[in-house]
């Protein structure tokens, strides 16, 4: 009878993560008596995957009944494959021996490659908000994919971006890989509703790429423009002054009225109007009792937006034509009926 040969017919096997890998192995003879073992890798550091004789291998099942003497099919199935299972698997025939079984013949090996899907891309923007015309960086990360080949694209509102740098790690062979990309985006005043999208395409995704998004509303700060105007006189000695705060984002805004440098009233933007581009407008007004002033009044609308240094706009109110009324020392009427926004 010819000497036993161990046949592993598949040079390589490709399996998707989470699926079951079948590693085929047959022997050409029933002689000698002894167990089959499966190893990953060769040499002294090889890892035992299955031993016909003894041990517990919960992920491994045999294709045929290996308990029987007449069996020559030593194929195994390994369940719930992960990228960590990648490697070359050897089917090795031992012969019964003492004190230990003796390695008799090995198969040529089967390389198991694992296809693993990339994780959902995570896009993160800068830690602090930036204003229009500034360039900000966005990063995109995805992990755990195999094989290494992968394509990453950046989009802003559907338009592909070109200013980005991408790295796939590690550079050498690995069970799985990660991708990291940084894109530069120039902000415009219209970007409150804009989105930055990172798109990852991989062989495991069957043409349906994964996307991660970041809303520029989390990144942009549009500073307000201020306009202070004097309205027609409502009563004989009252002047209505309005401060229009336009095109700001985000909404967080505090407005302070000053009369000749003294704080008259402070209020927080609450009921605002939203523009089509996502920015906000707000208006505050002040009733000034001109009879309370002997001299001209400098009215200042001071706005602190989103924790930034205050910006202000002033308006000079001429009061020379109005003699001061006796007993009045209140420059601005701050009654509840007056403390309302006009829009």
């Amino acid at each position: 009878e010819e000497e036993l040969q161990v046949i592993q017919p598949d040079k390589s096997v490709l399996v998707a993560a989470g699926e079951t890998a079948t590693l085929r192995c047959t022997a050409t003879s029933l002689i000698p008596v002894g167990p089959i073992q499966w190893f990953r890798g060769a040499g002294p550091g090889r890892e035992l995957i299955y031993n016909q004789k003894e041990g517990h291998f919960p992920r491994v099942t045999t294709v045929s009944d290996l308990t029987k003497r007449n069996n020559m099919d030593f194929s195994i199935r390994i369940g719930n494959i992960t990228p960590a299972d990648a490697g070359t698997y050897y089917c090795v025939k031992f012969r019964k021996g003492s004190p230990d079984d003796v390695e008799f013949k090995s198969g040529a090996g089967t390389e198991l490659s694992v296809r693993a899907k990339p994780s959902a891309p995570v896009v993160s923007g800068p830690a602090a908000r930036a204003t229009p015309q500034h360039t900000v960086s966005f990063t995109c990360e995805s992990h755990g994919f195999s094989p290494r080949d992968i394509t990453l694209k950046w989009f802003k509102n559907g338009n592909e971006l070109s200013d980005f740098q991408t790295n796939v790690d590690p550079v050498g062979e690995s069970v799985s890989y990660s991708i990291h990309s940084t894109a530069k985006v120039v902000l415009t005043r219209e970007d409150v509703h804009s989105q930055v999208i990172c798109e990852v395409a991989h062989v495991t995704l069957q043409g349906d790429p994964l996307r991660g998004t970041a809303n520029l509303s989390e990144t942009i700060r549009v500073p307000p423009t201020l306009e202070v105007t004097q309205q027609p006189v409502r009563a004989e000695n009252q002047v209505n002054v309005t401060c229009q705060v336009r095109k700001f984002y985000p909404q967080r805004l505090q407005l302070t009225w000053l009369e000749n440098g003294n704080v008259s009233r402070t209020e927080t933007a609450s009921t605002v109007t939203e523009n089509k581009d996502g920015t906000y407008n707000w208006m505050s007004w002040l009733l000034v009792n001109v009879s309370a002033h002997r001299d001209d009044v400098k009215l200042t609308c001071q706005v602190e937006h989103d924790g930034q240094p205050a910006v202000s706009k002033s308006h000079d109110l001429k009061v020379s034509a109005h003699p001061k009324e006796q007993g009045s020392n209140t420059a601005a009427e701050n009654t509840g009926s007056n403390e309302r926004n006009i829009y």
Partner: antibody, heavy 118, light 107 residues
């Protein structure tokens, strides 16, 4: 059904010969090592001989040179030719299949009685 | 030849008991150890191979363990049909050898 049936036992005088047969059915006979095991009345089991798939043979020391194991795969049959029989060879003779991957016995015949007596 | 020594030679137990029979080899047998059950007038029946693997069709109340030279057969809950003689056997190297047997009797 997997089955082993021994035959050929009987009474024989010391120094005589006897040929035991074991008829196998229900499995591919040629793919298994086959063994003979004996048991003297009221005693324990004693392994006697084996013939491998390739025809290789082994014997226990007390029967070497006197007993010959053989097989005819075409007839699904195992044989034990016993010569120069002694009183100490008196026993029930069982054939057994090395049915497990490691040649562990999994199937036994019902046995045939060999009595060596004058 | 490898000597196989079983203990005890005989054992009395009751239905429902858990019993243990031990077998010692005179040298390492690389776990190539089998256990057999034999009832009077019958052929032996295979129970365990490679020290701990259960033969097909054998109930799981039979369990084998051990390695090196010391091995154990455990029957977890004795039933009337379990009273018989039990043999261990090494089949690591020729000549294969059996233990002298343990007779399990009803108390």
């Amino acid at each position: 059904e997997v089955q082993l049936v021994e035959s050929g036992g009987g009474l024989v005088q010391p120094g005589g010969s006897l040929r035991l047969s074991c008829a196998a059915s229900g499995f591919t006979f040629s793919s298994y090592d086959m063994h003979w095991v004996r048991q003297a009345t009221g005693k324990g089991l004693e392994w006697v001989s084996v013939i491998g798939i390739a025809g290789d043979t082994y014997y226990t020391g007390s029967v070497k040179g006197r007993f010959t194991i053989s097989r005819k795969n075409a007839k699904n049959s195992l044989y034990l030719q016993m010569n120069s029989l002694r009183a100490g060879d008196t026993a029930i003779y069982y054939c057994s299949r090395g049915g497990n991957w490691d040649d562990a016995f999994d199937i036994w015949g019902q046995g045939t009685m060999v009595t060596v007596s004058s | 030849d490898i000597q196989m020594t079983q203990s005890p030679s005989s054992l009395s137990a009751s239905v429902g008991d858990r019993v243990t029979i031990t077998c010692r080899a005179s040298q390492g047998i690389n776990n190539y150890l089998a256990w057999f059950q034999q009832k009077p007038g019958k052929a032996p029946k295979s129970l365990i191979y490679t020290a701990s693997s259960l033969q097909s069709g054998v109930p799981s109340k039979f369990g084998g363990s051990g390695s090196g030279t010391d091995f154990t057969l455990t029957i977890s809950s004795l039933q009337p049909e379990d009273f018989a003689t039990y043999y261990c056997q090494q089949y690591n190297s020729y000549p294969y050898t059996f233990g002298q047997g343990t007779k399990l009797e009803i108390k």
